[in-house]
Interface confidence: low
């Protein structure tokens, strides 16, 4: 976390003496563009808590890593949210301080609440000056909840927020209805992005176990230590009056850190300095308590005394957080009784020991079964133990057996034996088996007999086209399941090999023998023929085709339709990707064009024989739609249509086409020709009684024109079922546009 502290001086008898200081322990902090990073920023944040405007606050930079805000003229200037921003680039961090008026109607029992994702947060506003009105809770300035005034419990209004999530973080306030917002109790809720003791993107990593009230950062897993503590786990207390990540900063003034609130980067929040508590951080810890806000209890044993800044001070012969550990002969700690490694790996083995005098790196050694003694390459010294790390030379099978960790100090010695099992990574003895094949995929059984040790943790299948020098493709599969190699090339030989792995570092075995597997792809042999086609517009053609009936499954992936425009020397190709399709609508064609059309079946990249070609003439673009189409029922089987000729005709109309459809019906519509283009009305006969019909029409010159509006009309009364609609006296069959 960024070493950034926002200090608030809470000696509030005189607002003019109030100040905020932001201190950065980062290299180059606050120097601006002439150094490593942007300057420290310290400002009042008026977005949520707005106060009456006053004279501007004064910002003073004190050296390279400190900035101070002064110039508060009245108590209301202090109320609200202040923030300090420091650090460069991705490490840029904002530290927030929330100030409550000591004379407010409601005061927070605790200003900063840091909780884990999924926890229940309880904000408690203590009644300082009672008003008999409802209490409004707000979250980030927006209304959240109302409590009746008589619902105070033990003089407190509680807001319970169960199962909190990170978006619930922010500034909360409790205000009496119709009271000044300056009399509110302001809170800061920080919700860590993970559950307790976890950090990382999926909250999969375990926190180091921060001590002394330190809080584990949910992004990087580091402990944000309370003011007055340091170390990776906040295990070390600073000297009284010191703070910062390395205890490098000193509290100003003769009374040390008394009266100062310390705010640190989230998820820590704010607290008093070590040894102090109370709303203004002016009260020393009660006996037996220590640390920030005096939240920690000493519980010293064996004659230890409690120091309110650092905790238990142990008498000679004892150590530990509570002086519970005797200075004693060395002891090997938490050594596993059995370890397992893979052949030819170079593992690191840790051995931890404690004692007095404290074990150092050279006092811990590791002995192999053959008597070879290894010395540690690195030691991690912690307050309660030393952990020696041994880099083991490349393991051979003879290294299996009992190893021994030994610690020796002037206080005595201790040793612990543990078993090391050296395992041989598995190697397949046979090639994988082909189960089924298709044109673009192979189904393979990957698990084969193997030499070496199990259990098998992963199976990798490596494959590439035969005789290829390209990289192998790899797929990791479940050992118990067959695997399908997808997206392969048809009619291609593939070299396929298996690699097995067992658990642990270096558990991957050598690749097994290769085998050749070939994808399938028979050539399509069926020749389709064109059944028919009809023009659906000046640029649209509906084509249908058939295939000869043959036993067995259809070998084909789809159809390719080809349209050849000989005049322009252009070919249009239309892919129909379903082998079941027998019709297609071709759109976007050129009106008035002569096309040669054929269709062929394809399979993989192979084309079957083309159908005999057909010649199609698309009509030129047709006339505009007829106008004012109207339908009028004449009887139980006749409806009269009337219309007006299209406007702006490019030539004489050759005919009209009427479309008839039963309203709501699922069948195809009927098309009926009106061959007397001078007419503006016609009678459709042979309709069913009491039936609703839809009509529309279009004109034809050289090609069919646009459809008119659709009109709807019902035939009258009850009559016999008709054979089908006809126009005038001509049979419908004659007039259908095929």
């Amino acid at each position: 976390a960024v070493d950034l502290t926002l200090l608030a001086n809470l000696r509030l008898t005189d607002p003019q003496r109030f100040f905020l200081t932001c201190v950065s322990g980062e290299a180059g902090a606050g120097r601006g563009s002439d150094a490593w990073g942007p300057p420290l920023l310290l400002e009042k944040d008026d977005r949520i808590v707005r106060t009456p405007p006053g004279p501007p606050l004064r910002l003073a930079r004190n050296g390279s890593h400190q900035v101070t805000l002064r110039g508060f003229s009245k108590p209301s200037d202090l109320v609200g949210v202040f923030s300090c921003v420091g650090g460069a680039g991705a490490r840029r961090t904002r530290v927030i301080y929330v100030h409550n008026s000591p004379g407010a109607h409601l005061l927070p029992d605790k200003v900063t609440h840091t909780v884990n994702k999924g926890d229940t947060a309880v904000l408690s506003a203590r009644v300082h000056k009672e008003k008999q009105t409802d209490v409004i809770w707000k979250s980030n300035g927006s209304y959240f909840y109302t409590l009746d005034w008589h619902e105070a419990q033990d003089g407190r209004f509680l807001l319970q927020l169960p199962n909190v999530q990170p978006p619930s973080s922010g500034i909360y306030s409790a205000t009496y209805l119709e009271a000044s917002p300056l009399g509110s109790a302001f809170f800061r809720l920080i919700v860590r992005g993970c559950g307790a003791g976890r950090w990382g993107p999926g909250c999969t990593k375990e926190c180091p176990g921060c001590l002394h009230g330190g809080v584990c950062h949910d992004h990087d897993g580091e402990c944000v230590c309370p003011p007055g503590f340091t170390g990776t786990r906040c295990e070390q207390a600073c000297r009284e009056g010191r703070f910062g990540q390395s205890c490098q900063e000193q509290c100003p003034g003769i009374s040390g850190c008394r009266g100062l609130t310390f705010c640190l980067p989230d998820p820590y929040g704010c607290s008093c300095g070590s040894g102090w508590r109370g709303s203004q951080c002016q009260e020393a810890c009660a006996p037996g308590h220590f640390g920030a806000d005096c939240r920690l209890q000493c519980q010293c044993q064996n004659g230890g005394t409690c120091d309110r800044f650092s905790g238990c001070v142990c008498p000679s012969g004892w150590h530990g957080v509570h002086c519970e550990k005797s200075d004693r002969i060395p002891q090997i700690l938490n050594m596993a009784s059995e370890l397992e490694f893979n052949l030819e790996t170079m593992p690191r083995i840790n051995c931890a020991a404690a004692g007095n005098p404290f074990p150092v790196r050279g006092s811990i050694e590791l002995r192999k079964p053959d008597g070879t003694v290894l010395l540690s390459t690195k030691a991690i010294v912690e307050p309660e133990k030393t952990t020696a790390e041994f880099e083991v030379p490349r393991l051979v099978l003879a290294d299996s057996g009992f190893w021994e960790c030994r610690v020796s100090t002037s206080g005595g010695q201790d040793s612990r034996r543990f078993k090391v099992n050296v395992k041989v990574p598995p190697v397949p003895l046979a090639a994988p088996r082909l189960l089924t094949k298709q044109s673009r995929q192979l189904v393979v059984s990957p698990l084969v007999s193997f030499s070496g040790d199990g259990p098998i943790s992963t199976v990798r299948l490596h494959y590439r086209p035969q005789d290829s020098t390209m990289d192998w493709s790899t797929i990791v599969v479940d050992p118990s399941e067959n695997v399908t190699l997808m997206n392969l090339r048809p009619k291609t030989g593939y070299s396929v090999r298996v690699q097995l792995s067992r658990p642990g570092e270096g558990g991957e075995g050598a690749w097994g023998p290769p085998t050749l597997m070939t994808t399938d792809c028979p050539e399509p042999l069926l020749q389709p023929w064109l059944e028919g086609w009809h023009v659906e517009g000046t640029d649209r053609l509906r084509v249908s085709w058939s295939l000869p009936l043959v036993p067995g499954p259809l070998v084909g992936d789809g159809f390719l339709l080809r349209l050849w425009d000989g005049t322009r020397g252009q070919e249009r190709r239309e892919n129909v990707s379903s082998p079941q399709a027998r019709t297609a609508l071709l759109t976007g064609l050129t009106p008035g064009t002569h096309y040669q059309l054929d269709v062929q079946l394809y399979h993989c990249t192979l084309l079957g024989p083309a159908s005999p070609p057909a010649h199609v003439l698309l009509p030129p673009s047709g006339p505009p739609a007829p106008r004012h189409l109207h339908a009028q029922a004449l009887s139980d089987s006749e409806i009269q249509l009337t219309w007006k000729h299209p406007e702006a005709l490019p030539g004489p109309i050759s005919k009209y086409v009427v479309e008839v459809q039963v309203a709501g019906g699922a069948g195809d519509p009927l098309w009926i020709d009106v061959d007397r283009p001078e007419e503006t009305s016609t009678i459709i006969r042979g309709l069913n009684a009491s039936t609703r019909y839809l009509f529309r029409m279009r004109a034809s010159i050289q090609g069919l024109g646009d459809w008119s509006n659709t009109v709807e009309e019902s035939t009258l009364g009850n009559g016999l079922q008709a054979e089908g609609p006809v126009q005038e006296s001509r049979a419908a069959e004659e007039g259908l546009d095929q």
Epitope: F144, Y145, L147, D148, E151, Q153, F157, Q160, P162
Partner: antibody, heavy 119, light 110 residues
Framework: EVQLLESGGGLVQPGGSLRLSCAAS????????MQWVRQAPGKGLEWVSS????????YYADSVKGRFTISRDNSKNTLYLQMNSLRAEDTAVYYC????????????WGQGTLVTVSS | QYELTQPPSASGTPGQRVTISCSGS????????VNWYQQLPGTAPKLLIY???QRPSGVPDRFSGSKSATSASLAISGLQSEDEADYHC???????????FGGGTKLTVL
């Protein structure tokens, strides 16, 4: 005068769905926590679900979790309960009720709507 | 089935004092307020007592509530015929994040 009026109940087959509504009037709806409580024929009351004033926080009884969804439209002063995968044991009169702050008491109740789940 | 335990029935004569008990556990009554609801025949429940012993406006002072450790009780003095109803106790349960109810007590005025 505070009024809560439920609607949307009826007969539904097991596995079916229903959506209950509760129209609120006579108070500032957007300020109150609301809940659904049900009462099986001849039985006691059973809390079903609660929703915070903003609509952003919801809670459910274990017996309905994953099947029922509570929601609210503050602009329409209406509370909803979407009930899916209904079972015979969901048969009950469903009441909507207004929450009364930290006391967690329900100070006003609707007249209820009967949901019958039967084949 | 019900987290809180109430006697299924109680009775008294007009003018008498009747007490209805309600027992729970540390996660509900033990750490939260108790509320009582009155449900007249064929009607919706009505809040009778909240926060253990508080009466909403309009509720006669003949009704009183109390709580001790993990149990609570509702007392009705000067029993009247219109008090014949079902009485339900309820308390928030921290482990459920929701309220739990008793099975209800049917009060008969003899």
């Amino acid at each position: 005068e505070v009024q809560l009026l439920e609607s949307g109940g009826g007969l539904v087959q097991p596995g079916g769905s229903l959506r209950l509504s509760c129209a609120a009037s006579g108070f500032t709806f957007s300020r109150y926590k609301m809940q659904w409580v049900r009462q099986a024929p001849g039985k006691g009351l059973e809390w079903v679900s609660s929703i915070y004033p903003s609509g952003g926080i919801t809670y459910y009884a274990d017996s309905v979790k994953g099947r029922f969804t509570i929601s609210r439209d503050n602009s329409k002063n209406t509370l909803y309960l979407q009930m899916n995968s209904l079972r015979a044991e969901d048969t009950a009169v469903y009441y909507c009720a207004r929450g009364r702050g930290t006391t967690r008491a329900f100070d006003y109740w609707g007249q209820g709507t009967l949901v019958t789940v039967s084949s | 089935q019900y987290e809180l335990t109430q006697p299924p029935s109680a009775s008294g004569t007009p003018g008498q004092r009747v007490t209805i008990s309600c027992s729970g556990s540390s996660s509900n009554i033990g750490s939260n307020n108790v509320n009582w609801y009155q449900q007249l025949p064929g009607t919706a429940p009505k809040l009778l007592i909240y926060s253990n012993d508080q009466r909403p406006s309009g509720v006669p002072d003949r009704f009183s509530g109390s709580k001790s450790a993990t149990s609570a009780s509702l007392a009705i003095s000067g029993l009247q015929s219109e008090d014949e109803a079902d009485y339900h106790c309820a308390a928030w349960d921290d482990s459920l994040n929701g309220p739990v109810f008793g099975g209800g007590t049917k009060l008969t005025v003899l």
